[in-house]
């Protein structure tokens, strides 16, 4: 029962996380114009991975897509790639995990196969979450770098009385959505991996009894059958889970690099 609950919860958490990753990837507010030093503009800019938008005080919003591939910064391309990889892996993971759910019966699928699929989807969710967190963190780091660079030369004088205020950008809502969604997907993946342990049949020692007509003493044959889980013995399984736990710890500590923001 606990295994089913863990697996189900892992699936739901991952589903929410992947929906969040998709939402974050599609959102236009990855970076928003910093208004701290210049709150008096009647025009406001925010940018996403796919287009840039301008919102006027009038309420009019105009968005323009980045209709170029070669002209875009390599970092932006990398973030796009990470987010897409995260979505693709997450989607495949969801598909696999649906069939792996203990509460869903598909033909005569053995628990060992379900355990296998649960672990596969769990690993996919973990990698998907890591991709999203990495993508968002790379973009955040890019923003921080550009923010301080533009602060250093805040006013790019045009000579004489005229001056143009350089636009600075700060964290947009999509970054926070991405971080949370990536974290949820990661947690969901870990839960799936934990559920996998419970799904895998324990190593069972069947006592084979042989009867002989001659009336000899009964022979016991221990270990006549080993439960096949498809991924080796439980000690090997343990390594996989430990690795997963380590990965989770690494992810949780990763955003701390950006604590200075």
């Amino acid at each position: 029962m606990a295994v089913t609950a863990c697996q189900g919860l892992g699936f739901v958490v991952s589903l929410i996380g992947i929906a969040g990753i998709i939402a974050a990837t599609c959102m236009d507010q990855w970076s928003t114009q910093d208004l701290y030093n210049n709150p008096v503009t009647a025009v406001f800019n925010y940018q996403g991975l796919w287009r840039s938008c301008v919102r006027e005080s009038s309420g009019f919003t105009e968005c323009r897509g980045y209709f170029t591939l070669l002209g875009l910064p390599a970092m932006l391309q990398a973030v796009r790639a990470l987010m897409i990889v995260g979505i693709v892996l997450g989607a495949i993971g969801l598909l696999v995990s649906i069939f792996a759910l203990k509460c869903i019966r598909i033909g005569s699928m053995e628990d060992s196969a379900k355990a296998n699929m649960t672990l596969t989807s769990g690993i996919m969710f973990i990698v998907s979450g890591l991709c999203a967190i990495a993508g968002v963190s790379v973009f955040a780091n890019m923003l921080v770098t550009n923010f301080w660079m533009s602060t250093a030369n805040m006013y790019t004088g045009m000579g004489g009385m005229v001056q143009t205020v350089q636009t600075r950008y700060t964290f947009g809502a999509a970054l926070f959505v991405g971080w949370v969604a990536g974290g949820l997907t990661l947690i969901g993946g870990v839960m799936m991996c934990i559920a996998c342990r419970g799904l895998a049949p324990e190593e069972t020692n069947y006592k084979a009894v042989s009867y002989h007509a001659s009336g000899h003493s009964v022979a016991y044959k221990p270990g006549g059958f080993k439960a096949s889980t498809g991924f080796g013995s439980n000690t090997k399984n343990k390594k996989i889970y430990d690795g997963g736990a380590r990965t989770e710890d690494e992810v949780q500590s990763y955003p701390s690099k950006h604590d200075y923001v």
Epitope: T41, A42, V54, T167
Partner: antibody, heavy 118, light 113 residues
Amino acid sequence: QIQLVQSGSELKKPGASVKVSCKASGYTFTNYGINWVRQAPGQGLEWMGWINPGTGETTYAEGFTGRFVLSWDTSVSTAYLQISSLKAEDTAVYFCARLYYGNRFDSWGQGTLVTVSS
Amino acid sequence: DIVMTQSPDSLAVSLGERATINCKSSQSLLYSGNQRNYLAWYQQKPGQPPKLLIYWASTRESGVPDRFSGSGSGTDFTLTISSLQAEDVAVYYCQQAYYYPLTFGGGTKVEIK
């Protein structure tokens, strides 16, 4: 069509208060901001501030804080400009204008003359 | 505040002739986000409210005759009346719509010579 209709002329004594109204029709009132512009006799145009009836946001120009209050009533699609402690230098024509795409004032009220005289 | 300086203060032009009004802002009105200049031109006749002619520096408002045109970018802008008509006698104002407070130029009075 889009119309902004302002209240009639007002003659007030110094120290009194006045409330100028601007009734909007022909569009969804909460979708666009209403700006107020002052024009003293024989002078140019001076932006006073604006309200966004959709968000409740108000912005005032530096010389128009304190005595000047912008408000609105969505139920009657009307914006208001209230001036308290009137002074002789408040004598002017007050216009309301809709803020439209391009941050442009595409529709204007006919103007309300406020005369402050003892 | 952004200072909008209009020149000349008044202008007398013969009917059918070209009238040119200049407007200079103390800061660039070109927004890098969409490459638009946030400048508008208004016409005000005596006893009437101002009427919008041009926005985004060069986009003509619907219903405005095509003899009115706007040009310029950054800090220097121009309103041109290609062939002055009697009904064009008015005061013309430029207005920046980029920074708060939104500010108007001092106005240019156009008369017939």
